[in-house]
């Protein structure tokens, strides 16, 4: 049998049943999430649920740049270090960098310091690039 791979929106890339869009525009975390949602299909800021997924995303982004952090869908809405994915995915895989997570930093970014394989917390009102994800 021929199994057709679902197609992603123009410019989005496909990996293991998901489509990803890397936006090289500056948005704060909440505006980035709203922009992701505006694409429908249940799109949100991206959850990253395995090392394989993280590696695929990191390789893709490194083709564009290697120094600008990127918002992902992990946040701490209660400001109690209780992190959760905005798309409702289980928070099992973790890839935090060794940086302190204190202060007013309740949104997560892919850090450029380790080729986008690790995360850092940052202030949610910071404007930076972002990564969206949906299941086609």
């Amino acid at each position: 049998d021929i199994i057709m791979r679902p197609s992603c929106a123009p410019g989005w890339f496909y990996h293991k049943s998901n489509c990803y869009g890397y936006f090289r525009k500056l948005r704060n975390w909440s505006d980035a999430e709203l922009e992701c949602q505006s694409y429908g299909n249940g799109a949100h800021l991206a959850s990253i649920l395995s090392l394989k997924e993280a590696s695929t995303i990191a390789e893709y982004i490194s083709g564009y740049q290697r120094s600008q952090p990127i918002w992902i869908g992990l946040h701490d809405p209660q400001k109690r270090q209780q992190w959760q994915w905005i798309d409702g995915a289980m928070y099992l895989y973790r890839s935090w960098s060794g940086k302190s997570m204190g202060g007013n930093k309740h949104c997560a970014e892919m850090s450029s310091n380790n080729n986008f394989l690790t995360w850092s917390s940052n202030e949610c009102n910071k404007r930076q690039h972002f990564l969206c994800k949906y299941r086609p």
Partner: antibody
């Protein structure tokens, strides 16, 4: 007042070389990425090259890569474009331009809100 | 990829005109789009940056937008005036370079 003034244009034979300069004033030159954009007679705009504020990163259109070199001297507030192995299709008005940056990391990602008047380069035998 | 613009557009004074800029591949939404106006014999002028932002000094008759469905950007000019006549270029980014559209000649009848 922010100003950019290009110079160095002229007539050159195919295969020849020419150097353009762009004198900047009215802003902190070293803080801004700079671009060269050209326009062939009766044609549209074509981005040629860009350089970061420090001069450490440079970018080129495929059509000029390996032939043109962009550089800057921040002590003189001047941008340069050295053009070698010139071809007839390089004939154009060359504009120097700069502006804000939507993403400071990407030096080629700067919109161009200040333009010079341009200098005409004619490549012909 | 390419940015495709209609070669020419004509409209009467006082009317509203919308100029389009379609990206041939990749998403128009991923990178900022700028619009430049070039009057005959003059250097280009930035009229819209970062998709929909207007530089100071540009009238609010000029507005920019992005439509991911049609994969295109638009420049809308309302209350068209004779001084709006000229060429309009969209511009975005591709990897390490800037890309301009071919331009649209706007004629105010």
């Amino acid at each position: 007042e922010v100003q950019l003034l290009e110079s160095g244009g002229g007539l050159v034979q195919p295969g020849g070389s020419l150097g353009l300069s762009c004198a900047a004033s009215g802003f902190t030159f070293s803080s801004y990425a700079m671009s060269w954009v050209r326009q062939a007679p009766g044609k549209g705009l074509e981005w040629v090259s860009a350089i970061s504020g420090s001069g450490g990163s440079t970018y080129y259109a495929d059509s000029v890569k390996g032939r043109f070199t962009i550089s800057r001297d921040n002590s003189k507030n001047t941008l340069y474009l050295q053009m070698n192995s010139l071809r007839a299709e390089d004939t154009a008005v060359y504009y120097c331009a700069t502006g804000g940056s939507g993403s400071p990391v990407y030096y080629y990602y700067h919109y161009l809100d200040v333009w010079g008047r341009g200098t005409l380069v004619t490549v012909s035998s | 990829f390419m940015l495709t613009q209609p070669h020419s557009v004509s409209e009467s004074p006082g009317k509203t005109v919308t100029l389009s800029c379609t990206r041939s591949s990749g998403s128009i939404s991923f990178d900022y789009v700028q619009w430049y106006q070039q009057r005959p014999g003059s250097s280009p002028i930035l009229v819209i940056f970062e998709d929909d932002q207007r530089p100071s000094g540009v009238p609010d008759r000029f507005s920019g937008s992005i439509d991911s469905t049609s994969n295109s950007a638009s420049l809308t000019i309302s209350g068209l005036q004779s001084e709006d006549e000229g060429d309009y270029y969209c511009q975005t980014y591709d990897d390490n370079r800037q890309v301009f559209g071919g331009g649209t000649k706007l004629t105010v009848l």
